[in-house]
Interface confidence: medium
């Protein structure tokens, strides 16, 4: 499969476990992948009794679940880890939970940050 309409070159990066994993905590990530495969951005988080705990954000490799998604929307009902992916630069800045089985849509806005570029 070729690149999608909204080609992804950069994503918002975040790692809650940055100290242990010895990475940056947040910034921008340049996406790299194989020539014939699509690239995406993702966001992952937990929801503990209504408190949102961001886990990771970054680049995600070719995944049909992300094709032609301009917004980052998690659709599973009550997962252990919420996950969404999308196509387009920085499309993972905002992320939403909208269960396929119905229920309230919840959108998470990022706090303002001064991102650093990860290469």
């Amino acid at each position: 499969s070729g690149r999608g309409e909204a080609e992804t070159r950069e994503c918002i990066y975040y790692n809650a476990n940055w100290e242990l994993e010895r990475t940056n905590q947040s910034g921008l990530e340049r996406c790299e992948g194989e020539q014939d495969k699509r690239l995406h951005c993702y966001a992952s988080w937990r929801n503990s009794s209504g408190t949102i705990e961001l886990v990771k954000k970054g680049c995600w490799l070719d995944d049909f679940n992300c094709y032609d998604r301009q917004e980052c929307v998690a659709t599973e009902e009550n997962p252990q880890v919420y996950f969404c992916c999308c196509e387009g630069n920085f499309c993972n800045e905002r992320f939403t939970h909208l269960p396929e089985a119905g229920g309230p849509e919840v959108t998470y806005e990022p706090p303002p940050t001064a991102p650093t570029l990860l290469t």
Partner: antibody, heavy 117, light 107 residues
Framework: EVQLLESGGGLVQPGGSLRLSCAAS????????MTWVRQAPGKGLEWVSV????????YYADSVKGRFTISRDNSKNTLYLQMNSLRAEDTAVYYC???????????WGQGTTVTVS | DIQMTQSPSSVSASVGDRVTITCRAS??????LAWYQQKPGKAPKLLIY???SLQSGVPSRFSGSGSGTDFTLTISSLQPEDFATYYC?????????FGGGTKVEIK
Amino acid sequence: EVQLLESGGGLVQPGGSLRLSCAASGFTFGSYGMTWVRQAPGKGLEWVSVISGSGGGTYYADSVKGRFTISRDNSKNTLYLQMNSLRAEDTAVYYCAKGPRIVGMDVWGQGTTVTVS
Amino acid sequence: DIQMTQSPSSVSASVGDRVTITCRASQGISSWLAWYQQKPGKAPKLLIYAASSLQSGVPSRFSGSGSGTDFTLTISSLQPEDFATYYCQQVFSYPLTFGGGTKVEIK
């Protein structure tokens, strides 16, 4: 209780075909990607194929591409694996598994044995 | 494709021992790694997801760590029911490849 039950395995000659089924219960089948994994006798696990919840997206391991077809019928809560042009090296226990990609496969069937000889 | 290399391929240990299994990816996979336990004649069972998160119902003596290319599964105090084969799997990029497995045997 969440359950997966495979069927359709058996003995087949090289070049032959088989269709495996996996009946799912206890969860909203159409909301989850489903996967086939196989294990040759005395060997490790090999990922075979995955299909999206809607059935619109599929991926295959290079070893089965062009010979195997994964499909699903969400109205019947059933996953399928159509296996054509079977080879001796396809001999294995075939497992179906549920799970969002990011957390791995959290529910597995008991497996069905395919012997190509 | 991303190759997953597990070591050791087998380990002999006694009840109460601390056992460590390592898994190395041929390229960075962030923390998108799962660990499974398989007993003879049975289907695999998910132990750890996202490199370090314990699957519901799995005893706390199992723990996972690592990020990028190097990962570890630790059994803090081996129990009789833990003698089995353990597999890692990367879930970052299709095909979702497994490691070759580590058999934990009774010493």
